[in-house]
């Protein structure tokens, strides 16, 4: 059957931990992505940012998992109003910020 939302969120959190701890070189060669507002619609916005990073196998599973939280199909070059379009940050920092926010959402029971 379908994975409960709480389990899916916990698995996403654990995947973000894994990719940040297993990196010996800079994550995705130090690629930069648009920063996002960590608010409603955040999963789609996060996916829209990360999907523009190509050739980085370390975040492929994260991209797939985020797509499960986003109700619409996301493709490269797509941007929502949730992006802070004047701020780019390294993928590693993006993942770190997203991870902390998701841990707080998990605590608050916001699984979707």
């Amino acid at each position: 059957g379908p994975v409960p939302p709480s389990t899916a969120l916990r698995e996403l959190i654990e995947e973000l931990v894994n990719i940040t701890q297993n990196q010996k070189a800079p994550l995705c060669n130090g690629s930069m992505v648009w920063s996002i507002n960590l608010t409603a619609g955040m999963y789609c916005a996060a996916l829209e940012s990360l999907i523009n990073v190509s050739g980085c196998s370390a975040i492929e599973k994260t991209q797939r998992m985020l797509s499960g939280f986003c109700p619409h199909k996301v493709s490269a070059g797509q941007f929502s109003s949730l992006h802070v379009r004047d701020t780019k940050i390294e993928v590693a920092q993006f993942v770190k910020d997203l991870l902390l926010h998701l841990k707080k959402l998990f605590r608050e029971g916001q699984f979707n």
Epitope: R10, I13, E14, V17, N18, T20, Q21, L99, L100, K103, K104, F106, R107, E108, G109, Q110
Partner: antibody, heavy 122, light 108 residues
Framework: QMQLVESGGGVVQPGRSLTLSCAAS????????MHWVRQAPGKGLEWLGV????????HYADSVKGRFTITRDNSKNTLNLQMNSLRAEDTAVYYC???????????????WGQGTMVTVSS | SYILTQPPSVSVAPGQTATITCGGN??????VHWYQQKPGQAPVLVIY???DRPSRIPERFSGSNSGNTATLTISDVEEGDEADYYC???????????FGGGTKLTVL
């Protein structure tokens, strides 16, 4: 100011019961999850259990499950810890602690009482 | 249940930086809190949610959490920082809180 004051500690014989109380003041008690934490002499901190802000849920550490019961009275701003079948290893300072309440009780303990000493000895 | 491992003791000279670790399986997936306890006193929260600091706590105290290790860092250590320090997480699999065994910080 915000305060938690424990009472009810003392010397009790093994196998007997004791109830600790905690009086809260200076904050909106009914909106916080409340916990009990203990510390045996010279040892570390041990979490005992939590009661949700509205009293609807309790969770306990395995070491006290079935022996200790946490209750609260939001109309009187009081928290209680009923301890049954006490053992020598229950000898400790008992702290009443508050934490903001979320869906999961993963919040930090932002206010502690000064503690009350319980000695279990024959 | 979930286990948190801390070094029993850490020693540092005044003015130096103290680093206290807290190890746990994939602890980076959990929110970590840190407490300071001085002899004869109740514990005091010094870091919450991995890296946030209560307003009354000096900026010298900072926290981080990644992989299997959370870290409490105290820079420019003072004699008044001498205390026991405990890390803590909520174990969502067993619905219980877990404390580390504590680390005694000695200021030389």
């Amino acid at each position: 100011q915000m305060q938690l004051v424990e009472s009810g500690g003392g010397v009790v014989q093994p196998g007997r019961s004791l109830t600790l109380s905690c009086a809260a003041s200076g904050f909106e008690f009914r909106t916080y999850g409340m916990h009990w934490v203990r510390q045996a002499p010279g040892k570390g901190l041990e979490w005992l259990g939590v009661i949700w802000y509205d009293g609807s849920n309790t969770h306990y550490a395995d070491s006290v499950k079935g022996r200790f019961t946490i209750t609260r009275d939001n109309s009187k701003n009081t928290l209680n810890l009923q301890m049954n079948s006490l053992r020598a290893e229950d000898t400790a300072v008992y702290y009443c602690v508050r934490a903001p309440q979320w869906y999961l009780t993963a919040e930090a303990f932002d206010l502690w009482g000064q503690g009350t000493m319980v000695t279990v000895s024959s | 249940s979930y286990i948190l491992t801390q070094p029993p003791s850490v020693s540092v000279a005044p003015g130096q930086t103290a680093t206290i670790t807290c190890g746990g399986n994939l602890i980076g997936a959990r929110l970590v809190h840190w407490y300071q306890q001085k002899p004869g006193q109740a514990p005091v929260l010094v870091i919450y949610d991995d890296s946030d600091r209560p307003s009354r706590i000096p900026e010298r105290f900072s926290g981080s959490n990644s992989g299997n290790t959370a870290t409490l860092t105290i820079s420019d250590v003072e004699e008044g920082d001498e205390a026991d320090y405990y890390c803590q997480v909520w174990d969502y699999s067993s619905n219980t809180y877990v404390f580390g065994g504590g680390t005694k910080l000695t200021v030389l």
